[in-house]
Interface confidence: low
């Protein structure tokens, strides 16, 4: 908000304003307005001779502003010429602006059909296990007054969730300055907003308009299960479609999925509606929709919904899924070679082909740089030459190979490790 | 909006869900919940053993997932053991999860209770001359049908212009698809805009909540002075104060300055109510408030209210606002030396002291740069020895100096200039 | 661990003042409601004050109201209870406890004991 | 206000007996916001029953509530030397019975 007083010199012709006098012949003006006022209305300079005497002053367009600076970009600058014949000490000169046409507005306004009462103030929540009182406070003026009573008034309180918007809010009419709010009016483990706002009563003899909105209150309802989908809602368009929609923590929804399930009459088969919607509200909650197909409003007119838990299964196939326990792994040496053996743990079942993966390296390498070797059904493998007298470490895993079953590798073996001879030298 | 078909896969333990087997003893499945769903909800792996039975699965917390990646930043990794006896080829698990309480909501929804009507489709604007026409459309389903039928229908109309707020915006009730607004709904030369919705009449059979708000619709409205001020309006508290309002466009506002004017009666004096307030109101119009003093509103009960420019003068005192005429300068020459002499116009009144500042400088140097004196009622100045063979000028101005006359400086002289003579060589 | 655990209690004359604190860790202190709930020597439980999770609801006994001031710092993990004009009957073991929803008090402190006394 | 009162004020009773502690309102609770707790000397209350009947983490299954409205029991079937003390009932998170002792006979 900004402050003006009564007389307070605000327009840009006025603060640019500017006259001087050489003293013996004439009087110099220069001022400025705007080119986008111009568009709308022109204003005229004018100079008060004596209290009834008010003469227009002809100016001319001017290229520059030596005397003042325009606080507008696009100034029109003016330069005018008095001629005057006699200046004394005392002389003071009265300058104004007047528009190019009468402007203005003219409205008679009855008391007691322009009535707005006063807001509420100190709006405050208390509460008393799971219900809510709000109370607030009017000022009625003086009570000698009586011009505007209590009884020509009552008070709008609305209230919603903080991630709803007003224009959802709930409404409650209240005739005294305070409203309880109980768990039929308010959802669990919510935080709720209220405002409140007085309007004339509807057998006051006033008319009007309601106060501004009260300062808004925040509040935790009573407490409740959060795992609990809420907030549960449904309506018919009157042709063919029940749309519902529901909230479910996100926390919740990320866990467990919630589907809507409906029934045309108590004895008839459930069925779960499809395909569901979702978008999010503000930050804590999911809101998903779905739209129940009402093929006969006339014969069914009652249909009972219910969000419940879907029974999502996955279905896994065990022969697809195998994931044998690791071999055992053993190193032999065989005269001047190494060999690698190992055992699988029995399967009951001995057609099932067997793919082994087989790797080995020396102590300082590491798995990634090892050799990698693929063998099926075998259960050894015969070593190329190795490097003398370095330590070797090997590993082998295994997975199932035939037609019609799989899986995924095996843990690896326990990794065995062993030092190759060193050779003699020739001489 | 997302969109989900009733059995997609969708929460963090069904997708992270894997299980593998050895084919001989022993299924081992591996999941992951939230930390954040846990606070409010756990959730436990349920085997289907047949149609009928359900068994918990066991799990403890593991430190890995090494089959899948957890879509979530706090994820808790779990793994689970079933022993198992025998393995076919055709064998599927089927697995689910199951939260440790009952979790949903339930509602018995009542056809005719649960009415939410169609929203209007089409909403467009006609006009002839001043008036407006507001047409739209509604799908009531088969014609058939007569579920829903026109009668129990009404629309909702609520325009504003661009500026204002949905909460402020004047509502129309029609019970067809069209609604007229006049001038006497809208104030000339503003940007309006509309939108329609359909809700439940109050004599149908049906009840339920209104439709959703049709898109938008905007117009001009019919032309008028947009230089004039708007929206004066007033409403008493009840108590002691009249509060008015009322808008202007920005630009004008710059260069005409409303007042508002007051009358507690028709045969009472006019009075100006003091401070306004301004405040911004969108990009085009200035809002501006004012508080009239209601001091007895059972004897004055109706004010007449007008918004009119104000006469704001700017007082400027002759003799503190002298510019005299620029002096004439001349140069002469006395000898070996140069002097200044210059000139004022006759002023009515000798008394007036005079002060001149007089500026001389080399034909190369700028202003700026010159040498400046400043003498009192003097006319004339001897120059100091200049350079030969050199052009010089000089300029002088004048401004009033005596005590309770005051001014700003004349304009310059204008300049003279002149050229030093050679000095003739010494032999 | 879960844990609650008070301090600042002492002995106090009648009239005097004092400032109780609770603090909490190896949970979401934020995520639930707090309460004081006091036991005098010999006595049975009496519960004394309650805060909501983010500290917009405040309820008090009758016997404390206008004497006792709840409040709780969720940064700093802490609830908070000062004490003014204490009178004899206020000595009692004090104690912190937690409440979520409807499931009850399930995580209490060890106490701290404040006694008023000329 | 809600007052609670409990009965009988001590319970004398061998171990292997089954308790039976009950709690009165003076008006209608939801069986939502009823809980029963424990407490021995010199410790703190420990949490044993909420919303009337569910038993909280760790509770052995000895122990089970039940009720609505105005009536609401604690059953312990079976005393174990540990479950020798005082019980309180509490309504909506404030107000607590006076407290019943069992105590061995």
């Known amino acids: 908000w900004e402050r003006s007083l009564a007389g307070a010199e605000e327009t840009i012709p006025l603060q640019t304003l500017r006259c001087y006098n050489d003293y013996t012949s004439h009087i110099t003006c220069r001022w400025a307005d705007t080119q986008d006022a111009q568009r709308l209305v022109n204003v005229t300079l004018i100079r008060r001779v004596n209290e009834d005497l008010l003469e227009p002053v002809s100016c001319d367009l001017s290229d520059d502003m030596p005397w003042s600076a325009c606080p507008h970009p696009r100034c029109v600058p003016r330069r005018c010429v008095i001629p005057c014949q006699s200046f004394v000490v005392t002389d003071v000169d009265y300058f104004s602006f007047q528009p190019d046409r009468p402007l203005g507005t003219r409205l008679t306004v009855t008391l007691t059909q322009h009535v707005q009462p006063p807001e509420p103030r100190d709006l405050q929540i208390s509460t008393d296990q799971d219900h809510f009182l709000l109370t607030w406070s009017v000022a009625l003026g003086s009570p000698q007054s009586h011009w505007l009573s209590p009884g020509d008034l009552e008070f709008e309180v609305v209230y919603k969730r903080l991630q709803d918007s007003w224009e959802d809010a709930a409404i409650l009419l209240s005739n005294t300055s305070q409203a309880t709010l109980g768990p039929e009016h308010l959802m669990p483990s919510s935080t709720y907003v209220a405002r409140v706002r007085t309007r004339l009563a509807p057998g006051s003899r006033l008319s009007g308009r309601p106060s501004k909105w009260s300062p808004e209150v925040c509040w935790d309802s009573q407490p409740g299960d959060e795992a609990q989908p809420q907030n549960l809602e449904c309506f018919f368009d009157g042709a063919a479609v029940l749309s519902c929609s529901w909230e479910v923590r996100k926390e919740v929804a990320s866990s467990v999925s919630f589907g809507l399930f409906y029934k045309p009459s108590p004895d008839a088969g459930e069925e779960e509606c499809s395909p569901v919607l979702r978008e999010g509200l503000g930050s804590l909650h999911t809101r998903h929709h779905c739209q129940i197909p009402v093929p006969d409003p006339a014969t069914h007119g009652q249909y009972i919904v219910s969000v419940q838990p879907r029974r999502a299964e996955k279905h896994i196939k065990s022969s697809v899924n195998i994931q044998m326990a690791p071999p055992s792994l053993n190193v032999t040496k065989d005269g001047d070679s190494y060999s690698l053996r190992w055992e699988t743990m029995k399967m009951r079942y001995e057609h099932i082909d067997h793919t082994f993966e087989i790797q080995y390296r020396k102590d300082t390498a590491t798995w990634k740089d090892s050799k990698t070797e693929t063998l099926q059904n075998a259960h050894s493998m015969a070593l190329p030459a190795l490097e003398p007298s370095t330590r070797y470490w090997a590993r082998v895993r295994v997975r199932t190979s035939r037609t019609g079953y799989n899986g995924i590798w095996s843990e690896w073996s326990e990794a065995r490790s062993w030092d190759t001879e060193s050779v003699l030298p020739m001489w | 909006w997302e969109r989900s078909l009733a059995g997609a896969e969708e929460t963090i333990p069904l997708q992270t869900l894997r299980c593998y087997n050895d084919y001989t003893s022993h299924i081992t499945c591996r999941w992951a919940d939230t930390q954040d769903a846990q606070r409010l909800v756990n959730v436990t792996l349920i085997r289907r053993v047949n149609e009928d039975l359900l068994e918990p699965v066991s799990c403890d917390l593991s430190d890995d997932m090494p089959w899948s990646a957890c879509p979530h930043p706090r994820c808790v990794p779990r793994r689970c053991v079933i022993p198992c006896q025998s393995f076919v080829v055709t064998d599927v698990d089927y697995f689910s999860f199951q939260p440790d309480r009952p979790l949903g909501t339930r509602l018995t929804v009542t056809l005719t209770q649960h009415v939410q009507p169609p929203e209007p489709r089409d909403l467009q604007i006609s006009t002839d001359q001043d008036h407006f026409l507001l047409t739209w459309s509604v799908a009531l389903g088969s014609p058939q049908s007569h579920w829903l039928s026109p009668g129990d229908l009404e629309f909702e109309v609520v325009y504003k212009r661009l500026q204002d707020s949905w909460e402020d915006a004047a509502i129309l009730l029609s019970n067809t698809s069209q609604a007229t607004l006049g001038p006497e709904h809208l104030m000339p030369s503003s940007t309006y805009v509309a939108r329609v919705r359909t809700r439940l009449a109050p004599g149908s059979r049906l009840s339920g909540r209104p439709s959703k708000w049709s898109p938008e619709v905007c117009w001009d409205s019919q032309p008028g002075d947009e230089a004039q001020p708007q929206n004066l309006e007033c409403f008493f508290d009840g108590a002691a104060v009249l509060s008015c309002s009322w808008e202007v466009r920005k630009e004008v506002a710059s260069s005409v300055s409303f007042g508002l004017f007051y009358k507690p009666s028709p045969d009472a004096g006019e009075e100006e109510c003091s401070p306004v307030l301004r405040e911004g109101l969108g990009s085009l119009h200035t809002r501006h408030h004012c508080q009239i003093p209601v001091p007895d509103p059972a004897t004055h009960g109706q004010y007449i209210v007008s918004v009119q420019p104000r006469r704001a003068e700017k007082h400027i005192k002759s003799s503190v606002n002298i510019q005299m005429a620029p002096p004439s300068l001349n140069v002469t020459k006395d000898g070996d030396s140069y002097s200044l002499r210059w000139e004022t116009m006759k002023m009515r009144y000798e008394h007036i002291d005079h002060t001149f500042e007089i500026q001389y400088r080399k034909d190369t140097a700028t202003w700026k740069d010159s040498k400046t004196e400043t003498l009192q009622n003097a006319h004339s100045m001897a120059l100091p020895a200049l350079e030969p063979s050199t052009r010089y000028w000089a300029r002088v101005r004048v401004r009033t100096s005596r005590t309770g006359y005051n001014g700003i400086w004349s304009e310059w002289s204008e300049a003279r200039s002149w050229d030093t003579e050679s000095v003739l060589p010494m032999w | 661990q879960v844990q609650l655990v008070e301090s600042g209690g002492g002995l106090v004359k009648p009239g005097g003042s004092l400032r109780l604190s609770c603090a909490a860790s190896?949970?979401?202190?934020?995520?639930?409601?707090m309460n004081w709930i006091r036991q005098a020597p010999g006595k049975g439980l009496e519960w004394v004050s309650y805060i909501s999770t983010s500290g917009s609801i405040i309820y008090y006994a009758d016997s404390v109201k206008g004497r006792f001031t709840i409040s709780r710092d969720n940064a700093k993990n802490s609830l908070y209870l000062q004490m003014n004009s204490l009178r004899a009957e206020d000595t009692a073991v004090y104690y912190c406890?937690?409440?979520?929803?409807?499931?009850?008090?399930?995580?209490w402190g060890q106490g701290t004991t404040v006694t008023v006394s000329s | 206000e809600i007052v609670l009162t409990q009965s009988p004020g001590t319970l004398s009773l061998s171990p292997g007996e089954r308790a039976t502690l009950s709690c009165r309102a003076s008006?209608?609770?939801?069986?939502?916001?009823l809980a029963w707790y424990q407490q021995k000397p010199g410790q703190a209350p420990r949490l044993l029953i909420y919303g009337a009947s569910s038993r909280a983490t760790g509770i052995p299954d000895r122990f089970s509530g039940s009720g609505s409205g105005t009536d609401f029991t604690l059953t312990i079937s079976r005393l174990e030397p540990e479950d020798f003390a005082v019980y309180y009932c509490q309504q909506y998170g404030r107000t607590f019975g006076q407290g019943t002792k069992v105590e061995i006979k």
């Open positions: 190896g949970f979401t202190f934020s995520d639930y409601y």
């Open positions: 406890a937690r409440r979520r929803y409807y499931y009850g008090m399930d995580v």
């Open positions: 008006q209608s609770v939801s069986s939502s916001y």
